[in-house]
C-alpha cells in the first residue's frame, strides 16, 4: 500500500517516497512510480544549504560597500555569502546587513575589547589606580605614574581622567 | 482520471512511414512522467521504442536504430509518433502509455 | 540492453490455489539512490496491459491485495496468493531503471 510517512532525505507526495535534492540543487520535477526526483544545480549566484524540495535556489547575500559591508566568505552552491564590516566598522545584527562605526571609550573608560568587523568596542571604567584622558576606540586604561621610582612626591592626586602631578620632595623639612 | 487514446492510419505501406498521434486527458503531458510508445506484433510480446518527457527530452530504443521520432504539441496534449523506412516486421499493436495508463492500442498493418 | 528472463513461460493453476512466477535482470536493477524500478503487468486477452505492481513491491490503485511482488537486485517475484478466474492473461515485467526499458517475454496463465 501506499506509504504515509517516508525515510530521512525523503519526502511524501502523491502517495510517492520521493528523494529530497542534495544541498546546491533545486527540484525540477517529484519522482513518480516510475522515476526519480529530478533535480538541478544552483546557479553560480545562488545556493540552497539543506536536503530541500525548493524549485528556486536563493540569491547570495550581496556585501553591499555602500553600506560598509564587504566580503569575509564568497558563497557556493551550498553555503551563502558571509559579509563583514570594512576597517573602523562593525554589524549592526548577527546577520551583518549593515555597519555602523566602532565607538570610542571617553575619557575615564578605557578599552577593554577592540572592535571587531562584527563587534563593537567594549569599554571598562578606569579602576583606582588608572587614568584615561582621551576618547579613543584603542587606548586601555593607563596606569597612575608612581612618583616614588622617579624619587618624587605626589603633587597632585590622580583621577580616574587624570594622571597624579608629581613633584620634588620638600628638603626644607 | 487519466486517458490515453491513439489515433492514425491502419495501413501503411512498406518504406513509407508510420505516423500516430496520442491524446491525453485529465493531466498535462507537461506537469510529470514520461509519455511512451509501446507495441506488439501479433502474438508476440512487448517492445519498448521510446517516449517524450514532461520536459520535451527524448529515448529511444536503440534496436529501431534511429527510425523513430517521439514529438508532442502541447496545445492539444498530444504526443506523436513517426516510424520511418517501415517493412512488414512493424506491423504490430501500438500503444502510447504513461506507464500506469495505457492507451487501448491501435493495429498498424504495413503492406503493400 | 538489461535482458529480462521470465519463467515460467506459462502454467496453469486450479483456482483458489497460489501462483508464483520469476523474473530475472542480467544486471542489477537498483539505481545509486537505491530504488528499483520494476513493475509487473497483466495483459487479459483482447486488452491493453494492466499495471498491477510498481517498484517491485507496491500494488497501483485497485489491485487486489491477493498480487504481491518482492525482489531486489536481479531477482523478481509475482506471487498471487489465491488464482481466481479473472486472472487470466500474459503476465510481464518491466525494467524502467535503465534506458532501453526493457519487457520480459511474458507468462501465460490459465485455469485449470
Known amino acids: 500500500e501506499p506509504p504515509t510517512a517516508c525515510r530521512e532525505k525523503q519526502y511524501l507526495i502523491n502517495s510517492q517516497c520521493c528523494s529530497l535534492c542534495q544541498p546546491g540543487q533545486k527540484l525540477v520535477s517529484d519522482c513518480t512510480e516510475f522515476t526519480e526526483t529530478e533535480c538541478l544545480p544552483c546557479s553560480e549566484s545562488e545556493f540552497l544549504d539543506t536536503w530541500n524540495r525548493e524549485t528556486r535556489c536563493h540569491q547570495h547575500k550581496y556585501c553591499d560597500p555602500n553600506l560598509g559591508l564587504q566580503v569575509q566568505q564568497k558563497g557556493t552552491s551550498e553555503t551563502d555569502t558571509i559579509c563583514t564590516c570594512e576597517e573602523g566598522l562593525h554589524c549592526t545584527s548577527e546577520s551583518c546587513e549593515s555597519c555602523v562605526p566602532h565607538r570610542s571609550c571617553l575619557p575615564g573608560f578605557g578599552v577593554k575589547q577592540i572592535a571587531t568587523g562584527v563587534s563593537d568596542t567594549i569599554c571598562e571604567p578606569c579602576p583606582v589606580g588608572f587614568f584615561s584622558n582621551v576618547s579613543s576606540a584603542f587606548e586601555k586604561c593607563r596606569p597612575w605614574t608612581s612618583c616614588e621610582t622617579k624619587d618624587l612626591v605626589v603633587q597632585q592626586a590622580g583621577t580616574n581622567k587624570t594622571d597624579v602631578v608629581c613633584g620634588p620632595q620638600d628638603r626644607q623639612r | 482520471e487519466v486517458q490515453l487514446q491513439e489515433s492514425g492510419p491502419g495501413l501503411v505501406k512498406p518504406s513509407e512511414t508510420l505516423s500516430l498521434t496520442c491524446t491525453v486527458s485529465?493531466?498535462?503531458?507537461?506537469?510529470?512522467?514520461?509519455w511512451n510508445w509501446i507495441r506488439q506484433p501479433p502474438g508476440k510480446g512487448l517492445e519498448w521504442m521510446g517516449y517524450?518527457?514532461?520536459?520535451?527530452?527524448?529515448n529511444y530504443n536503440p534496436s529501431l536504430k534511429n527510425r523513430v521520432t517521439i514529438s508532442r504539441d502541447t496545445s492539444k496534449n498530444q504526443f506523436s509518433l513517426k516510424l520511418s523506412s517501415v517493412t512488414a516486421a512493424d506491423t504490430a499493436v501500438y500503444y502510447c502509455?504513461?506507464?500506469?495508463?495505457w492507451g487501448q492500442g491501435t493495429t498498424v498493418t504495413v503492406s503493400s | 540492453d538489461v535482458v529480462m528472463t521470465q519463467t515460467p513461460l506459462s502454467l496453469s493453476v486450479t483456482p483458489g490455489q497460489p501462483a508464483s512466477i520469476s523474473c530475472r535482470s542480467s544486471?542489477?536493477?537498483?539505481?545509486?539512490?537505491?530504488?528499483?524500478?520494476l513493475n509487473w503487468y497483466l495483459q487479459k486477452p483482447g486488452q491493453s496491459p494492466q499495471l498491477l505492481i510498481y517498484?517491485?513491491?507496491n500494488r497501483f490503485s485497485g489491485v487486489p491485495d491477493r498480487f504481491s511482488g518482492s525482489g531486489s537486485g536481479t531477482d523478481f517475484t509475482l506471487k498471487i496468493s489465491r488464482v481466481e478466474a479473472e486472472d487470466v492473461g500474459v503476465y510481464y515485467c518491466?525494467?524502467?531503471?535503465?534506458?532501453?526499458?526493457?519487457f520480459g517475454q511474458g507468462t501465460k496463465l490459465e485455469i485449470k
Open positions: 518491466l525494467q524502467v531503471t535503465h534506458v532501453p526499458f526493457t
Open positions: 517498484r517491485v513491491s
Open positions: 485529465g493531466y498535462s503531458i507537461t506537469s510529470n512522467y514520461y
Open positions: 544486471q542489477s536493477l537498483e539505481n545509486t539512490n537505491g530504488n528499483t524500478f
Open positions: 502509455a504513461r506507464l500506469d495508463y
Open positions: 517524450i518527457r514532461y520536459d520535451g527530452s527524448n
